[in-house]
């Protein structure tokens, strides 16, 4: 189920790459965030908290990512036209409950000016 399009700027372009921003509520302590391209899982990041508030970050499908207190950024490099597609942030909240899965996304448009290595 697609819950909706992101209500924020999801794609940030720089240096021939793109930062894809996946937000989550900042009260969330344990979650899994997956980046989907179409229906395919490109990246994932799981944050868990153990005893003594020790934080563990795991990735089964690793991408360059950055975690803040209310977002996960996934970075895609060397953009070309094949990157144009629908991208979705698939968030699974574990704690605090209730368990909740949300899917939000948008279409990544690739313009010549955003490509990494334009042929002169």
């Amino acid at each position: 189920e697609i819950n909706g399009s992101a209500n924020y700027e999801m794609f940030i372009f720089h240096n021939g790459g793109v930062q894809i921003l996946c937000k989550y509520p900042d009260i969330v302590q344990q979650f899994k965030m997956q980046l989907l391209k179409g229906g395919q899982i490109l990246c994932d990041l799981t944050k868990t908290k153990g005893s003594g508030n020790t934080v563990s970050i795991k990735s089964l499908k690793f991408c360059h990512s950055q975690l803040s207190n209310n977002s996960v950024s996934f970075f895609l490099y060397n953009l070309d036209h094949s990157h144009a597609n629908y991208y979705f942030c698939n968030l699974s909240i574990f704690d605090p409950p209730p368990f909740k899965v949300t899917l939000t996304g948008g279409y990544l448009h690739i313009y010549e000016s955003q490509l990494c290595c334009q042929l002169k």
Epitope: N3, G4, N7, Y8, K23, P25, D26, I27, Q29, Q30, K49, N53, N70, I93, F94, D95, P96, P97, P98, F99, K100, T102, T104
Partner: antibody
């Protein structure tokens, strides 16, 4: 139906502590976190904090750190909040509220009816 | 801290009229929620995620807005709608409420 039953009114002396309760029914208690909110004439409504029934993790509004302590008893489906070193500024109605999520954020989907705490000598 | 300012503080209208309640945030928030409070009753969730109608809430209630300006609209007031309404933001810590708008019968 889903209900949050709060304990009755409390009259306490300055400097004392009070522990108020919130019992959940009509749903699986451990499947939701619980928030606490203060309502006073001076400050309207203030978010105090939340406790995860699942992990016992707590998240306090910094303003209430050291003033409020949230705990849960899973066996009785009850959340508790203890208020310490009470002053007249702590006189208020305290509400519990069940945590829920939308697509983008979180909110309280069910509230208790409130517990009135009066601090007076 | 994000300050939520509700206006007007009091709104006097008659049943059947349209009510528009505003909530202005001191800085941008991702979403707004709206609650109703009646004397001696528990708060009731009306709108979550800015515009989504909570379960069991009549369709005459609606929410809109983005950034710093949000609105709760009641299209045609019923006698039971006269109460105090609060906006709430949970996207910027510490999470905050507006001071409330009292909707009273004219």
């Amino acid at each position: 139906q889903v209900q949050l039953q709060q304990s009755g009114p409390e009259l306490v002396r300055p400097g004392e502590s009070v522990k108020i309760s919130c019992m959940g029914s009509g749903y699986t208690f451990t499947d939701y976190a619980m928030h606490w909110v203060k309502q006073s004439h001076a400050k309207s409504l203030e978010w105090i904090g939340l406790i995860s029934i699942y992990s016992d993790h707590t998240n306090y509004n910094q303003k209430f750190q050291g003033k409020a302590t949230m705990t849960v008893d899973k066996s009785s489906s009850t959340a508790y909040m203890e208020l310490a070193r009470l002053t007249s500024e702590d006189s208020a109605i305290y509400y519990c509220g069940r945590n829920n999520y939308g697509n983008y954020g979180w909110y309280f989907d069910v509230w208790g009816a409130g517990t009135t705490v009066t601090v007076s000598s | 801290e994000i300050v939520l300012t509700q206006s007007p503080a009091t709104l006097s209208l008659s049943p059947g009229e349209r009510a528009t309640l505003s909530c202005s945030a001191s800085s941008s928030v991702s979403y707004m929620h709206w609650y109703q409070q009646k004397p001696g009753q528990a708060f009731r969730l009306l709108i979550y995620d800015t515009s989504k109608l909570a379960s069991g809430i009549p369709a005459r209630f609606s929410g809109s807005g983005s950034g710093t300006d949000f609105t709760l609209t009641i299209s045609s007031l019923e006698p039971e709608d006269f109460a105090v309404y609060y906006c709430f933001q949970g996207s910027g810590y510490p999470y905050t409420f507006g001071q409330g708008t009292k909707l009273e019968i004219k």
